[in-house]
Every structure is written in C-alpha cells, then in structure tokens.
C-alpha cells in the first residue's frame, strides 16, 4: 500500500524482477492417468517432482497444457479429457468427443489444450490427468505434449 | 551471479525492461504451405521477412499461432496440420481430423492452435507451415489466423 | 524516445511495473448471446461491468477466452462460435463444427478457445459473444468457461 513515488528502493522492491517458468514435454512411457514429464525440459524457479511442477515463488501464474491425441476409433464415440490439477484438486478441464460417427476408422487426430491464470503459493503442485492416456502417442509426437507455466506477477 | 542488493544500477541491469512482441494476421492470398503474414500488424523488437518472424533480442519467448479452417468435406476424412518451425526445423505441430464420417457435407469449421515457450537467439526465424493451406479461408476469416510472439524474459 | 542510460528515474518510468489482470468464470445462468461473468473472480487493474471487462490502464494486453460446450446432437451438424469483442466490435472469432455425421447421439463435448494481443485504451470494453450459449453447460462445467486478460506492456 501507499505511494512511494520517488523512493527508488521502494519502487524496485515492488518491481516484477523475479521470473519463474517451466516448459516440459511428456515422458516417453505413460502408464497411468496422471501424466509424467521429462525432467530435462526448461525449468527456472520451478521444481519437478513425481509428475508435479512444484512452485517455489508465490504469485500469479499462467499455466497452459497442450496434448496431441491419436485415436484408433472403436465402434463408438470417445471422450478425450484433459484435467489441470492444483494440489491434487481438479481446477479446470477440457473435453472433446471424437469418433462421433461410430465408424471404425484407421485413426483420428485431436488436439486439446487448457490454460489457467491463478495465484499459487510456495509448494503448490501443478499436474495433469488424462483418462485416455493410451491415446497420447509419444512415439509419433514426442514434442507435442507439453505443460508450461510462467510467473506473471510475483506477490509483493 | 552474486547479490547486488542495494546497488540500483546492478538491479536495473537485470530487470526485464526490454520487451518484444508481434501479432500478425495471415496474408490475404495464400499459395504455398509456408504461410505468409501481413506486415502491417503489431511488430516491436521483432522483424518480419519472407514469411518469417526474425528475433532481434535473445530471450525466452512465448509463441502462439491460431488458425481457422473451413473445409468442404470430400468423401474421406481430412487431417489438418499446423507446424511451428524454428530455423526451418519443426518444433511443434498440432493435428486434427475433420470430415471423419466420410460424408460430403456442405462445410466444416475447425480451429487449431499451437503454442511454444522457448529460448530464441538473435536472427532466429519463426514460421508456420500448413499442409492444407487451401482450407484457410482468408475471405471469410481475415482476422482469425494469427501468429504472435512476446518476449517473457530477456537474456541477462 | 531518447536514451536515458544512467538516469534511474527516467529508466524506472519506462519500466513495466504496472500490472493488470483478470480471470473470470462464466455466470451460472446464461440467457443471452453476450456472456456474463462471475464478479468474484480475479480482478486487478481491470473492472467488470455488465458482461464487460473494462480496461483501466492503457497498454498491450493478452486476452484469452476458453469455453467448454456440451451438445445434444440434433439430426444435423452444429456450428459453435466464440466471438471476442472489443468495444462491441468483433475482433476475433473461432468456429468449430460438431455433430457432423448428422446422427442423433447422446452428447458431444467440444472445447473452443480464442486469444488476442492488442493495444487497449482506458475504458475499452472486452466481451464475449456465443450464438449457441445454450450449449455452455454451466452446471457440469462451472469452472471451465473463462475470460482472462493480462497487461503485457504498459504504454510509456
């Protein structure tokens, strides 16, 4: 609070100098609905642990996840779902129905993304859940499935 | 490295004052898979040349492209693809299958987007490739097809 | 213009200290094509009024809207549309066709997003229009339908 007009140190303390970001690609071998990620991606001011991004500086974060699906259509429609979880709670989800004609086709591509703008505290975890993880084709699309966060404004 | 606590010039030199951004709309007449863009969009600290955005300040960039397709369905499914290229190498792609019922319908709308968070050096080129450029309807949707970048954190 | 190298106050006046942002979820009961939003979302340096976000600080803004649709397919295809309006003018739209097989199915999920990077003046209004607002299922997806803006670079 308050106005610190010409007091430089006061102004600087409020400046958004701290920056934190992450950009991780999905791990090669997925075997559960909670996605895991390659630890050798871009990580700065954010930790990666057990499938979670762990926040190290409090503030307002922009979070975005994008997944590329490849579905071998069965003879019914398929609902693809992407869930963004904060501290193991679903914060936001995106759903798309594919194979809606009910025809068994060779394959169908679908791309799904989800974003979030939220205040996150230190040690908050960010993770992604996908019911149909078997449709995330990491051999064809190893670079396409990503989870990214960046700090927009740190807490004063 | 090091702590420059009360040394204002030291602090300021590390501050993210430099900002670069671009927001370009697709050119009216497309005749090849590499998309070209209207030069009269928003450009600040980024150049446009021959279908490429050319980076002028090194740093961590957020890149996002969104395309609006309008497909006159043939009697087979159609795979729409959007590729983000960095220096003529595919960095990330998004694919969606439309017209999957195999029925010749009047038209089908589809929207496809792709984002990227990446460190880019000076003179790095950013471009977009689309297999089926004929489905990007620039007469109906002149404002919908865009390529945008902004510098999130400049290199110290 | 001009170079103010070591003049700290000059440098600081140009620094991106001002930050503005919003992240609003769609209102529970929708009854018109112009969407209304919950006022109890995240609002900082941006006002909410009558379905509009109202800009309070001039600058370059990143605007993003994401909507989750749930369509009970009729026996014809359905075009879902999301329009981003600036001062009541359509600035950008996204369209997707669902139920394209023409079969009456139980339900089809579709997710639609749209972003914009634009210079906005004080009192500029940002709003969202959806023809088929009846397909935005706020009981199933109260958190999924959001409008967000953040100031990337304030005007010098």
């Amino acid at each position: 609070g308050g106005n610190c007009s010409e007091d430089l140190l006061c102004i600087l303390k409020r400046a958004p100098f701290k920056k934190s970001w992450a950009y991780l690609q999905v791990a090669k071998h997925l075997n559960k609905t909670k996605l895991s990620w390659n630890k050798d991606g871009i990580l700065h001011g954010v930790r990666y642990q057990d499938g979670n991004l762990v926040i190290q500086f409090p503030g307002l974060y922009f979070i975005i996840c994008q997944l590329q699906f490849l579905v071998q259509c069965p003879n019914n429609s398929v609902d693809l779902k992407l869930e963004l979880l904060i501290n193991k709670h679903i914060k936001k989800q995106a759903l798309v129905t594919v194979c809606e004609s009910g025809m068994q086709t060779k394959h169908v591509y679908q791309n799904l993304s989800q974003f979030l703008l939220d205040y996150l505290q230190v040690n908050t975890t960010v993770s992604v859940n996908v019911d149909t993880f078997q449709y995330i084709d990491t051999s064809t699309f190893p670079l396409e499935n990503v989870l990214s966060v960046f700090l927009y404004s740190n807490s004063d | 490295g090091g702590n420059c606590s009360e040394d204002l010039l030291c602090i300021l030199k590390r501050a993210p004052f430099k900002k670069s951004w671009a927001y370009l709309q697709v050119a009216k007449h497309l005749n090849k898979t590499k998309l070209s863009w209207n030069k009269d969009g928003i450009l600040h600290g980024v150049r446009y040349q021959d279908g490429n955005l050319v980076i002028q300040f090194p740093g961590l960039y957020f890149i996002i492209c969104q395309l609006q397709f309008l497909v006159q369905c043939p009697n087979n499914s159609v795979d729409l693809k959007l590729e983000l290229l960095i220096n003529k190498h595919i960095k990330k792609q998004a694919l969606v299958t439309v017209c999957e019922s195999g029925m010749q319908t009047k038209h089908v709308y589809q929207n496809l987007s792709q984002f990227l968070l990446d460190y880019l050096q000076v003179n790095t080129t950013v471009s977009v490739n689309v297999d089926t450029f004929q489905y990007i309807d620039t007469s109906t949707f002149p404002l919908e097809n865009v390529l945008s970048v902004f510098l999130y954190s400049n290199s110290d | 213009g001009g170079n103010c190298s070591e003049d700290l106050l000059c440098i600081l006046k140009r620094a991106p200290f001002k930050k503005s942002w919003a992240y609003l979820q769609v209102a529970k009961h929708l009854n018109k094509t112009k969407l209304s939003w919950n006022k109890d979302g995240i609002l900082h340096g941006v006002r909410y009024q009558d379905g509009n976000l109202v800009i309070q600080f001039p600058g370059l803004y990143f605007i993003i809207c994401q909507l989750q649709f749930l369509v009970q397919c009729p026996n014809n295809s359905v075009d879902l549309k999301l329009e981003l309006l600036i001062n009541k003018h359509i600035k950008k739209q996204a369209l997707v066709t669902v139920c394209e097989s023409g079969m009456q199915t139980k339900h089809v999920y579709q997710n639609l997003s749209q972003f914009l990077l634009d210079y906005l003046q004080v009192n500029t209004t940002v709003s969202v229009n959806v023809d088929t607002f009846q397909y935005i299922d706020t009981s199933t997806f109260p958190l999924e339908n959001v409008l967000s803006v953040f100031l990337y670079s304030n005007s010098d």
């Epitope: 490849l70 071998q72 060779k106 394959h107 084709d137 990491t138 051999s139 064809t140 190893p142 670079l143 | 090849k32 898979t33 590499k34 693809k81 590729e83 290229l85 960095i86 220096n87 003529k88 190498h89 595919i90 960095k91 471009s127 490739n129 689309v130 297999d131 | -």
Partner: antibody
Framework: QVQLQESGPGLVKPSETLSLTCTVS????????WSWIRQPAGKGLEWIGR???????NYNPSLKSRVTMSVDTSKNQFSLKLSSMTAADTAVYYC??????????????????WGQGTTVTVSS | QSALTQPASVSGSPGQSITISCTGT?????????VSWYQQHPGKAPKLMIY???NRPSGVSNRFSGSKSGNTASLTISGLQTEDEADYYC??????????FGGGTKLTVL
Amino acid sequence: QVQLQESGPGLVKPSETLSLTCTVSGGSISSYIWSWIRQPAGKGLEWIGRIYASGNTNYNPSLKSRVTMSVDTSKNQFSLKLSSMTAADTAVYYCARDYRVAGTYYYYYGLDVWGQGTTVTVSS
Amino acid sequence: QSALTQPASVSGSPGQSITISCTGTSSDVGVYDYVSWYQQHPGKAPKLMIYEVSNRPSGVSNRFSGSKSGNTASLTISGLQTEDEADYYCSSYTSRSTWVFGGGTKLTVL
C-alpha cells in the same frame, strides 16, 4: 548395429496383394520409425510409406488407397501390404530405418540403414 | 507428390569437383532443412551421404558436402575419385509428412 532383412514372395499375380516383411536385428523396433521404398528396374527411388512403433502411418499419396503397413514389436518386424498389383508395381522393394531425433527440434537424419532389397515381379 | 528435379547425368574427371542440383517446391525443399542425399552403386542398396542439407554421417568422406538456397538443394563432390561413380538421389521431407525423392543423377568419372 542395426540390420534389416526383407522377405516375401518374388512373384505376385496381377490384382493380388503383395505382402512383405522386414525383420530388424541389432536394435529395438520400438525406438525408431520405419519406411518402405521401391525401385523399378533402371528407374529412380519411390518412397511408399512409414510406420511408427505405435502403429501410426504416413503413406505416399499416390499409393495411399492400396497400402497398409503394420508393426509387430514382439517379433521386431514391420510389414507392407500393397493391393491390386499390376506390372507397374514390379520393382526392388527396400525397407529402411527412418531416423528422426526429437531433441530441441525434430531432426530428420534421413533413411540411414537399408535392407539389401527384394525383387518382386508381377506376372500371371 | 511430384518427384524432385535432378539432372539425369553429370560427369567429371578425377580430382575435379562436380555439383548436382535438386529442385523442389515451397512445400518440401523450400520450407524445411530436411534434405538428404543418397549414393547407389549398381545392384546395391542406397547409402546415406548427407542429411539435413549439409551434415555428413560418420564414415562419409568430407569430400561430400551439401547446401541449399530457396527451393534448390545441391550436392558437391570435390576431388572426384573413380569409386564416386554411382547414381545419386536427393530426398526431402514434405508438408504432408512424407518423403519425396529426386529422379536420380548418374555420375560418370571420366
């Protein structure tokens, strides 16, 4: 080091379906992408298609309606089926490793390991 | 998909340099740096000589070099040797996620 060996009939009747198998030794089939290429006598190379370990495929548009490729990771083999054969399909058929590395970007190192080829003749 | 365009034949004397061109379109050679070159001796399988426009696999002589400008790629062989006599094929990745080959060039060492 990876080696490839094509196998299948040397003679196919017109209108029948050609079936070829490529056996991979010295490496796992799951780690790479695999292509088929053919070469009519005295002519140039023609790319037929590729298959990923997941079974996803890309085919030459001019052959797409007739081509089916599959992969059997348990046998370290991948296969090509080409239907409605005609005399124009007479050629040497090669299998090859389609070497892509997904690092900072997608790097395509080309078709870096080839089988020795198998001659297929279409005749009644 | 149309084949890339190569000259049918080129020739040179031992010790000389020759260049083989490969012209594609803005949907293949022009858009990606995914151009490869292959050498094929009679009755043998092709051998990869250059990948990604100008890179040599290990074991390939540095007499072989590649370049690209616009929609045209080039293979240059310097210090020609008799064993270089063979057919050479260029190849490019395409926007359709496929490979396309050139028609081939017969190199004769005089």
